[in-house]
């Protein structure tokens, strides 16, 4: 390419920056353990970390977890992207009565226009069914005159809504205008949890939240409650709990109305890519080659790369690199690229901790 | 030194099949993808295929779906592009590169490139 060679050129002598044949451009070389966000980076700000799948990277710089949309009556909404959470909704039929961060914390059925009624707006996942009286004048559904009371100024009759949470059973039913009640199918075996805060009977100001306890007269001591799994976070929202179910994890601590629960890697493994509340990736203790030691790289698909150790260090089997993260894998074999320069080796410092636990604890 | 070394071009008549490889030596920095491109006499550089490296993902250029592979041997350090039912549209420089996956994209950086190896496809 002679017409390239001046561009070339200028990224010469320049450890920084290197020069892509395929778009004709220098481009910034992100740091070991970065990763572009762009085909050519530009400058520092192009480089992020790299989280495991179903993590994604927040506004902090955290490997943060993916909400799942694994409830029966969620369904994904948006993926979880590198840098942004899987968002869930109600799946369609229902709407979201006590939202989440990215998620909903209870769904409930659409309400079905009672008699006389019609729809004015039909139910999103976002919000419940508006109803209107089917005609201005007295509905002709109406068995007699004095069944028929139009609505006070101002108010649009709304059959109450059926609430659904994780729980399963068969179908519900309500009370609704005038005493006749009205049954719901669910589509999937939903209803109610029977230890739900929330009844259809008993006033709520806020759906899906109640009291932890019942209020003392005269006290504000009422404060929000989440539904099963999620907790009350330092913004006041519900927050799905993390899940310690991957076969690496322990629970560490539960999952409490304000705080999360906390995963660590189970025993004989450790913590190689942080998250909130958990761990990304765990591994194995290393066990080291006579003469081998690995070569930390935070990199999306888990390559390792394998070299000497520096001379007069002995492998200690149990290394911390300068990060603080171990190393991603001991097996050689997820890597196509191999150092075969003994004098590029990382210095690993044989007295640093060896972190445990991720949760910053 | 970084250095990509291709191999296994050379002259082969339409309809028949080439293997190239690419060794790499030295450390790759960060590198978790390779893929091969190509330029044809006069014409600008074409990206042909690529893999990810750790997950063995790979992705073709529509040109050579179906008719080129690509794989790797991780014990040899070797990256590999075999190609079959070749065309005189597929006479061209065949390089390799190495780089990084781009985040939230199957596209990667190519940040260390071979010298190349010339394949002619004639009768």
């Known amino acids: 390419f002679p017409q390239d060679r001046p561009f070339e050129d200028t990224c010469h002598g320049n450890p920084s920056h290197y020069y892509d044949k395929a778009v004709r451009r220098c481009c910034y070389r992100c740091p070991m353990g970065l990763f572009p966000t762009q085909q050519c980076p530009q400058r520092p700000t192009d480089c992020r970390k790299q989280c495991e799948p179903d993590y994604y990277l927040d506004e902090a710089d955290r490997c943060t977890a993916c909400v799942t949309c694994s409830r029966d009556d969620l369904v994904e909404k948006t993926p979880c992207a590198w840098n942004s959470s899987r968002v869930c909704e109600c799946r369609p039929g229902m709407f979201c009565s006590t939202s989440a961060v990215n998620s909903c914390a209870r769904c409930f059925f659409h309400s079905v226009c009672p008699a006389g009624m019609i729809v004015k707006f039909p139910g999103t996942a976002q919000k419940n069914t508006v109803c209107e009286p089917a005609s201005p004048g007295v509905s002709p559904a109406c068995a007699s005159p004095e069944n028929c009371k139009e609505p006070s100024s101002g108010t649009i009759p709304q059959a109450k809504p059926t609430p659904v949470s994780p729980a399963t059973s068969s179908a519900s039913t309500m009370p609704v205008r005038g005493g006749t009640r009205l049954a719901q199918e669910a589509a999937s075996k939903l209803t109610r949890a029977p230890d739900s805060p929330s009844s259809v009977g008993r006033p709520s100001s806020d759906p899906g939240l109640s009291p932890t306890q019942p209020c003392p007269e005269g006290s504000g001591d009422c404060r929000k409650q989440c539904e099963p799994d999620y907790y009350l976070d330092e913004a006041g929202r519900c927050t799905a709990c993390v899940s310690c179910s991957r076969d690496d994890l322990v629970e560490k601590t539960p999952c409490a109305w304000n705080s999360s629960r906390t995963c660590e890697c189970r025993p004989g493994m450790i913590c190689a890519t942080s998250a909130t509340n958990s761990c990304a990736r765990c591994v194995p203790y290393p066990i080291c080659a006579a003469e081998t030691v690995t070569k930390p790289q935070d990199m999306a698909e888990k390559d390792t790369t394998f070299e000497a150790p520096p001379l007069g260090t002995q492998p200690d089997c149990n290394p911390t690199p300068e990060n603080g993260e171990a190393p991603a894998s001991t097996s050689p074999t997820q890597s196509l690229l191999v150092d075969s320069q003994a004098s590029k080796t990382l210095p690993i410092p044989t007295s640093a901790p060896v972190a445990l636990s991720s949760t910053g604890k | 030194e970084v250095q990509l070394v291709e191999s296994g071009g050379g002259l082969v008549q339409p309809g028949g099949s080439l293997r190239l490889s690419c060794a790499a030596s030295?450390?790759?920095?960060?590198?978790?993808?390779m893929g091969w491109f190509r330029q044809a006499p006069g014409k600008g550089l074409e990206w042909v295929a690529r893999?990810?490296?750790?997950?063995?993902?790979?992705y073709y250029a529509d040109s050579v779906k179906g008719r080129f592979t690509i794989s790797q041997d991780n014990s040899k350090n070797t990256l590999y592009l075999q190609m079959n039912s070749l065309r005189a549209e597929d006479t061209a420089v065949y390089y390799c590169?190495?780089?990084?996956?781009?985040?939230?994209?199957?596209?990667?950086?190519?940040?260390?490139w071979g010298q190349g190896t010339l394949v002619t496809v004639s009768s």
């Open positions: 590169a190495a780089g990084r996956v781009v985040l939230g994209a199957v596209v990667c950086t190519n940040e260390y």
């Open positions: 030295g450390y790759i920095y960060s590198s978790n993808c």
């Open positions: 893999i990810h490296t750790g997950s063995g993902s790979t």
